[in-house]
Every structure is written in C-alpha cells, then in structure tokens.
C-alpha cells in the first residue's frame, strides 16, 4: 500500500513538475526590466527564451521573436537545449511511469517489469529536474553577471536588439517557476526510485530442491545453509535481499531489488 502511495505521489509530483518546466520554458518573463532606477517607466521590457516583449502603460503589448538562430548567444542556446531535454525526458518518463503504476493493470505485466519501468521513469524525472534547474541557474547566472556590467549590451546581437545602457534586467517569474518545477520533478523522480525498491516480485528468494537420501524421497527446504547459499532462515516468507545467488534448477531469472539500485 505504501509502495503504491509513494509511486502514485511520485507520479503526481513529477507531472506537476514537468507541467511547470513546460510552462517556464514557454513563458516570456525569464528576465524583466529592473525598475529600481525608474519605477515609473512608461514602457516595460521583459524577455523569454524565444522572444522579447514590451508592455506599454497604454496597455499595448508587443512581442518579437528571436528570428535568428546563429545570432543568438551560446548561453541562451544552451539554456534552451537544457529545458527542451528536460521536457523530452520528463514526457518520456511520464509515459513510462503511467504503465508502471501499480494501480494500473496492463495485461499480465510482471511486477518486475513494473519495478524496472518505475526505476527508469524515476531516473528520467531526476535527470529532467536537474536539466531544468541547470538551465534556469545558467540563465540566472547570466542575468546576475550582466546586471552589474557597465557596458550597454546584455545579449549582443540577440534578435538584432541593442540594449540601451539604462535598461537593466533582473529575475523574471519564469526563473522561479523553473526552479520550483525542476525541484518537484527531481523529488518526484526520487519518490519513484524509492517506490521501485518495494515493487520487486513478492516471491521467496529460493526454490524447493529435492534431495534423494538413500531410499527415502524427502523434499528439504533448506534454511540453515547460510555459508553455502547466502540465505538465512525464511520461514515466514519475508522478502529478503538476495545477493544474486540462484539455485541450480531456477529456470527464470528475476532481477532482485539490488539490480535496480
């Protein structure tokens, strides 16, 4: 039950996180005009990863896309790439995790397969979250650096724009959305990985082996072969971690919990 809850919660948290990453990537307010020196500005600038906008006090807003690819700074391209990779990994992770959910039955899917998928999606969410956090942090660092620069340009050649010296930029709402969303995706991924540990097959970690002792046909279930097999007594059929050891007549090999970690 706890495993299902952890997995379900991990999925929901990751879903919210990825939605946030997508929102942040699409938002125009990655950097906003710093109004410290001019709080009564008539024209307010803000910029995103894809376009820059101007909002007039008249209520009119105009946005212009960065219609150049080669003219954009490498840092901006890197941030775009990180965010897109984060979204793609997150989307794939979501797709995988839907099928991995314990509460959803798909044919005769083994628990081991669900455990595998849960771990895969968890790792994808973690990487996705890290990509988003990295992307937002790189952009934030770029803003901090440029904020204190005395030169006029912030993004040299960005979309053919020239920044005037009085226009300084500070953190926009998208950065905070991105950080929070990345964090949520990361947390969701960790929860999925934790849930995976409890999803391995509910089986005993040994098989019944027949031993033929001089004329008697008795089936022994060894419990005291600690030295030779690595197992201790498991009379209550508790789930234990095997070290990868298998009995000779085991036909199908199930990965243990340790195989995922």
């Amino acid at each position: 039950m706890a495993v299902t809850a952890c997995q379900g919660l991990g999925f929901v948290v990751s879903l919210i996180g990825i939605a946030g990453i997508i929102a942040a990537t699409c938002m125009d307010q990655w950097s906003t005009q710093d109004l410290y020196n001019n709080p009564v500005t008539a024209v307010f600038n803000y910029q995103g990863l894809w376009r820059s906008c101007v909002r007039e006090s008249s209520g009119f807003t105009e946005c212009r896309g960065y219609f150049t690819l080669l003219g954009l700074p490498a840092m901006l391209q890197a941030v775009r790439a990180l965010m897109i990779v984060g979204i793609v990994l997150g989307a794939i992770g979501l797709l995988v995790s839907i099928f991995a959910l314990k509460c959803i039955r798909i044919g005769s899917m083994e628990d081991s397969a669900k455990a595998n998928m849960t771990l895969t999606s968890g790792i994808m969410f973690i990487v996705s979250g890290l990509c988003a956090i990295a992307g937002v942090s790189v952009f934030a660092n770029m803003l901090v650096t440029n904020f204190w620069m005395s030169t006029a340009n912030m993004y040299t050649g960005m979309g053919g724009m020239v920044q005037t010296v009085q226009t300084r930029y500070t953190f926009g709402a998208a950065l905070f959305v991105g950080w929070v969303a990345g964090g949520l995706t990361l947390i969701g991924g960790v929860m999925m990985c934790i849930a995976c540990r409890g999803l391995a097959p509910e089986e005993t970690n040994y098989k019944a082996v027949s031993y033929h002792a001089s004329g008697h046909s008795v089936a022994y279930k060894p419990g005291g072969f600690k030295a030779s097999t690595g197992f201790g007594s498991n009379t209550k059929n508790k789930k234990i971690y095997d070290g990868g050891a298998r009995t000779e007549d085991e036909v199908q090999s199930y990965p243990s919990k340790h195989d995922y970690v």
Epitope: A42, V43, N45, C53, S58, E62, Q166
Partner: antibody, heavy 118, light 113 residues
C-alpha cells in the same frame, strides 16, 4: 464614434479646489489608459497625469504631484481630475485624452477651461 | 526628465512647398525590446484640440494625409510635409512617450507666406 467630453472647469480662487470630469463614449472605456493634458493660454501642451487601465497605477507631472489626483470610474465611463491647492499657474484648458499604441493620445476632448484667479 | 526641443519655433512657407521640422530629445527614445522610437507628433489648429499625426516616430495615424511623413531614431526626429496645403497651418508638437513624465516640445508654428 469616440467622444470625450470634459466638464467641471470654471473660475476658482488660489488655494481652492475643483473636480474635472470626462465622460467617455463610443469605446470600451475600461480597456484604455487615460490622461489629462493642459494648455495654458497662448502656451504649449503640458502633460498632467495618467491612469492605467485598471486604475492601479497613476503618474503625475512634478508640477501637480501631491495636489492633483487622477481617478476613474469604469462603471460610469468617466475619468476624473481632483485639483486641490490651485495656483495661478494652473490656469489652462484641460484636455482629457485616450492612450493607444506607442503611448500616443489618439483622441482628445474639446477641453474645459480652468481659471485660477483672485 | 526628458527634454524635448523643437526647431524652428516658426516657419512661413509657400503653398506646395516642402517643409521639414525637427525634434530633439535629451535622451534616446529608442526602446530596445521592440526597436521602436517612442515619439509622437501632434497637429493643433487654432481653437481646436491637438490631433495625432504619428506614433512610434513614423507610424502614420489613420486619416492622416500621406503628404505627412515622420522619421528619425534615437534622439533626432523629423516631421516632413511634402507639399504644404492651406489646411496645414497649425502648431506641430512632438512628444516623448518613452518615459514618465511625458514631455512635449515647445511646438513649431507653420504659417503660409
């Protein structure tokens, strides 16, 4: 047809108060930023105050700051300018204007004359 | 505050003549975000309220005859009337729309010889 009609002007003594009104019609008043601009007799234009669409932000010329208050009533499609502590230099024709793209004032009322004299 | 200076203060021209008036701002009116110059031109005929001619320095307001043209960027702007007509007699004002307080130039008075 867009129309802006100012009222409330008149003769007032220095230190007195006056409230100007501007009745707007022919457009969605609540969707536009509005301004007051004045023109002293035989002189040029002087921007007085601006109120943003929602009314949350107001801007004033230094010469009127603290004395004049711009406000709006979107339900009545009316713009106001409350003028307190009037001075002789406030004597002018006051125009109500509508701001559009580029912060330009595309429509102006006919103006109302405010005379501050003892 | 941005100071707007117009030149000349007045000019008298013959009908059909080309006329140019200038407006200079104390700081750039070019907005980096959209590459627009936040300057507008107004025409005020005697006894009438001003009428908008241009916004964003060169965007003609609807209904304005195409003999009028606006140009310039940064701090220097020009209003040109290619062929002056009798009805063009007025005072022309430029205005800073870039930042508050909005400021007007002192105006250029156009007369017919």
């Amino acid at each position: 047809e867009v129309q802006l009609l100012e009222s409330g002007g008149g003769l007032v003594q220095p230190g007195g108060s006056l409230r100007l009104s501007c009745a707007a019609s022919g457009f969605t008043f609540s969707s536009y930023t509005m301004s007051w601009v004045r023109q002293a007799p035989g002189k040029g234009l002087e921007w007085v105050a601006t109120i943003i669409i929602g009314g949350s932000y107001t801007y004033y010329a230094d010469s009127v700051k603290g004395r004049f208050t711009i406000s709006r009533d979107n339900s009545k499609n009316t713009l106001y300018l409350q003028m307190n502590s009037l001075r002789a230099e406030d004597t002018a024709v006051y125009y109500c204007t509508r701001l559009v793209k580029g912060q330009a004032m595309d429509y102006w009322g006919q103006g109302t004359l405010v005379t501050v004299s003892s | 505050d941005i100071v707007m200076t117009q030149s000349p203060d007045s000019l008298a021209v013959s009908l059909g003549e080309r006329v140019t008036m200038n407006c200079k701002s104390s700081q750039s009116l070019l907005q980096s975000g959209n590459q627009k110059n936040y300057l507008s031109w107004y025409q005020q005929k005697p006894g009438q309220p001003p009428k908008l001619l241009f916004y964003w320095a060169s965007t003609r307001e609807s209904g304005v005859p195409d003999r009028f043209s606006g140009s310039g960027s940064g701090t220097d702007f020009t209003l040109t009337i290619s062929s002056v007509q009798a009805e063009d007699v007025a005072v022309y004002y430029c205005q800073n729309d870039y930042s508050y307080p909005f400021t007007f130039g002192q105006g250029t008075k156009l007369e017919i010889k």
